[in-house]
Interface confidence: medium
């Protein structure tokens, strides 16, 4: 239903908490520069607005589209050129262009210092001394850093810091309880990040009809009691809202998600008998326990898949009569059927269906042709399979930093062109994937394996866009989404790779590293040890091994040390001569 | 090309019954949800009642609940109302629905005349 004010509508849709939250991620999303202060004054002046929207819609400039408004706030900042260079160039675009524009400008990687957080007592003082300050600087710092973040539910992950925050601050050891706590919101909302953004690429990309067509595989697995109408009436909606949220129409795409969380807690009967817990909670919490809720009993009665896609005499008949809605049913069926695969899987499955339809409905015999289709996705099916039973056997092996070591030098190896800083951290994100999955029982495993992976992938497609280097990496990644992870795994040795001369500065360390903390540590490791790939593309997996043991002792020998700057300075080079002797 | 034939009304007296089907054919008649809907005379459509592809789940409207009952048989590709207790208020035309999007139904019959009346 059209409204005479949008903004309005939304503001009292929300409410004033979620709306104001919701602005300062948008600004935040938008200009990442700008500091807490400058954007706060901005919400405050669009949450008066849309006050005086809210008591009279007739009201000057309210029946402009919230696009405009944010857009006119952002383009009337002082010095917009100065900070932001081009992006200021926006500013002389009309809408929608204008918005099209800042899309365009949003920044994956921005340039700011990695988020710290404060010593628990002073977290604590600025928490009790001013809430809402406190949670608008977690939203306004994230929103930054992570420009397509799900903005619901980042408000999701305000309120969870906030309930941590006020249960915490009063026990007598702070820090016992918050750094647990708050690791743990922080490793949910970094993955959630990583996901979203992955959405983002994949609407961006490959349009609505993939991302929907991912949709009604996921919502298929969680809800396989529901009908296929019911499924497709889901994937729209999810569809709908995500696009929103990419697009940067955040007000409309937080409704939006509120309104189907309402839809399925009233059709719980239609959609699956696991919602009833979730339909208790309050909103932001309700659509969040929607969204990671675990998949109903699959019905004990299925039909074989065999019956409706390859058995029946109509197959052809009813593939030509309305293609997607075929497909779509096809995709229905088999993801209810396997909660098991990943939705990377289903879908190749489904393109893979789709490509033997199109190839034999034009031929002769079309059954003949098309009845050995469910057995020639046996390979498709074994592939992840086993990369799921290889990698988490290394990683049982190896533990999480071994494992990530292992993956780091693997990745070095197929793509040494990209930076060391951008490999180090794909690494390790993909080395997670270890203790994320690895510990799942059989049954979860590839889905939680593949489709974390297929994240991870995402993000450094993402970054390597930006400064494309590698040929391979532009390969894998131009591709369909679905073959990324596939593409990356089948990489081998890039051959081409001029390895990259030995710099005694690259490995050359102070006593400053004594007294990082651990994850920093390793980081510094993990950055040598892709230097030496980078040095050595084809060195084996004892001489590294040998090196990074080596320098392993030599750390921990100097941090022991007396005169640690000392130890650092005349044993240093002799770990080097011996590093370049051993990788010979 | 998509066809729902209705058949099975005429006139009843109150309290009497019937039995409506309805004929598809033109698309995998297993895979919808399908339902009937009424027109009374001078009176805007009211949802009567649907039933899921695989005939698990059904609604029906308050005015008709415990008195009317849809059912489908895949295999004849035929979806059924069977009504019972008629009353003068359920005179309409009923006609049969094909569904493509959960409650948002894409195809309709031509419609079958049910009259109660003394």
């Known amino acids: 239903e059209a409204h005479k004010s949008e903004i309005a509508h939304r503001f009292k849709d929300l409410g004033e908490q979620h709306f104001k939250g919701l602005v300062l991620i948008a600004f935040s999303q938008y200009l990442q520069k700008c500091p807490y202060e400058e954007h706060i004054k901005l919400v405050q002046e669009v949450t008066d607005f849309a006050k005086t929207c809210v008591a009279d819609e007739n009201a000057e400039n309210c029946d402009k589209s919230i696009h405009t408004l944010f857009g006119d706030k952002l383009c009337a900042i002082p010095k917009l050129r100065d900070n932001y260079g081009e992006l200021a160039d926006c500013c002389a675009k009309q809408e929608p262009e204008r918005n099209e524009c800042f899309l365009q400008h949003k920044d994956d990687n921005p340039n700011l210092p990695p988020f710290q957080r404060p010593e628990a007592e002073a977290m604590c003082t600025s928490f009790q001394e001013n809430p809402t300050s406190f949670l608008g600087h977690y939203l306004h710092e994230v929103a930054r850093r992570h420009p397509y973040f799900y903005a619901p539910e980042l408000l999701y992950y305000a309120e969870k810091y906030n309930e941590v925050l006020t249960q915490c601050c009063t026990e007598s050891d702070k820090a016992a309880c918050l750094t647990p706590k708050l690791d743990a919101v922080k490793e949910k909302a970094l993955v959630a990040a990583v996901r979203q953004r992955m959405k983002c690429s994949s609407m961006q990309r490959f349009g609505e009809r993939a991302f929907k067509a991912w949709a009604v595989a996921r919502m298929s697995q969680r809800f396989p009691n529901a009908e296929f109408a019911e499924i497709t009436k889901l994937a729209t909606d999810v569809t709908k809202i995500n696009k929103e949220c990419c697009h940067g129409d955040l007000l409309e795409c937080a409704d939006d998600r509120a309104e189907l969380a309402k839809y399925m807690c009233e059709n719980q009967a239609t959609i699956s008998s696991k919602l009833q817990a979730c339909c208790d909670k309050p909103v932001l919490q309700k659509s969040q326990c929607l969204a990671e809720i675990e998949h109903d009993n699959i019905p004990a009665d299925l039909p074989s898949i065999a019956a409706d896609f390859v058995e029946d005499k109509e197959v052809c008949k009813n593939y030509a009569e309305a293609k997607d809605v075929f497909l779509g049913t096809f995709l229905y069926e088999y993801s209810r059927r396997h909660p098991d695969y990943s939705v990377s899987l289903l879908l190749r499955l489904a393109k893979k269906y789709e490509a033997t339809l199109e190839k034999c409905c034009a031929e002769g015999d079309p059954p003949a042709c098309y009845g050995t289709v469910l057995a020639e996705f046996q390979p498709l099916v074994e592939e992840p399979k086993n990369l799921v039973k290889t990698n988490c056997e290394l990683y049982e092996k190896l533990g999480e930093y071994g494992f990530q070591n292992a993956v780091l030098v693997r990745y070095t190896q197929k793509a040494p062109q990209v930076s060391t800083p951008t490999l180090v951290e794909a690494a390790r994100n993909l080395g997670r994937v270890g203790t994320k999955c690895c510990t799942l029982p059989e049954a979860q495993r590839l889905p939680c394996v593949e489709d974390y992976l297929s994240a991870i992938l995402n993000r450094l497609c993402v970054l390597h866009e930006k400064t494309p280097v590698s040929e391979k990496v532009t390969k894998c990644c131009s591709g369909s989404l679905v073959e990324r992870r596939p593409c990356f795994s089948a990489l081998t040795v890039d051959e081409t790779y001029v390895p990259k001369e030995f710099k005694a500065e690259t490995f050359t360390f102070h006593s400053d590293i004594c007294t990082l903390p651990d994850k920093e540590k390793q980081i510094k490791k993990q950055t040598a040890l892709a230097e030496l790939v980078k040095h050595k593309p084809k060195a084996t997996e004892d001489q590294l091994k040998t090196v990074m043991g080596d320098f392993a002792q030599f750390v921990d020998k100097c941090c022991k040390a007396a005169d640690k700057d000392n130890c650092f300075a005349t044993e240093g080079p002799n770990l080097v001569a011996r590093s370049k002797e051993a990788l010979a | 090309e998509v066809q729902l034939l209705e058949s099975g009304g005429g006139l009843v007296q109150p309290g009497g019954s019937l039995r409506l089907s309805c004929t598809a054919s033109?698309?995998?008649?297993?895979?919808?949800?399908m339902g009937w809907v009424r027109q009374a005379p001078g009176k805007g459509l009211e949802w009567v009642s649907w039933?899921?592809?695989?005939?698990?789940?059904?609604y029906y409207a308050d005015s008709v609940k415990g008195r009317f009952t849809i059912s489908r048989d895949n295999s004849k590709n035929t979806l059924y109302l069977q009504m019972n207790s008629l009353r003068a208020e359920d005179t309409a035309v009923y006609y049969c629905?094909?569904?493509?999007?959960?409650?948002?139904?894409?195809?309709w019959g031509q419609g079958t005349l049910v009259t109660v009346s003394s």
């Open positions: 629905a094909k569904s493509y999007h959960a409650d948002k139904f894409d195809y």
């Open positions: 033109g698309f995998t008649f297993r895979h919808y949800r």
């Open positions: 039933i899921r592809p695989d005939g698990t789940f059904t």
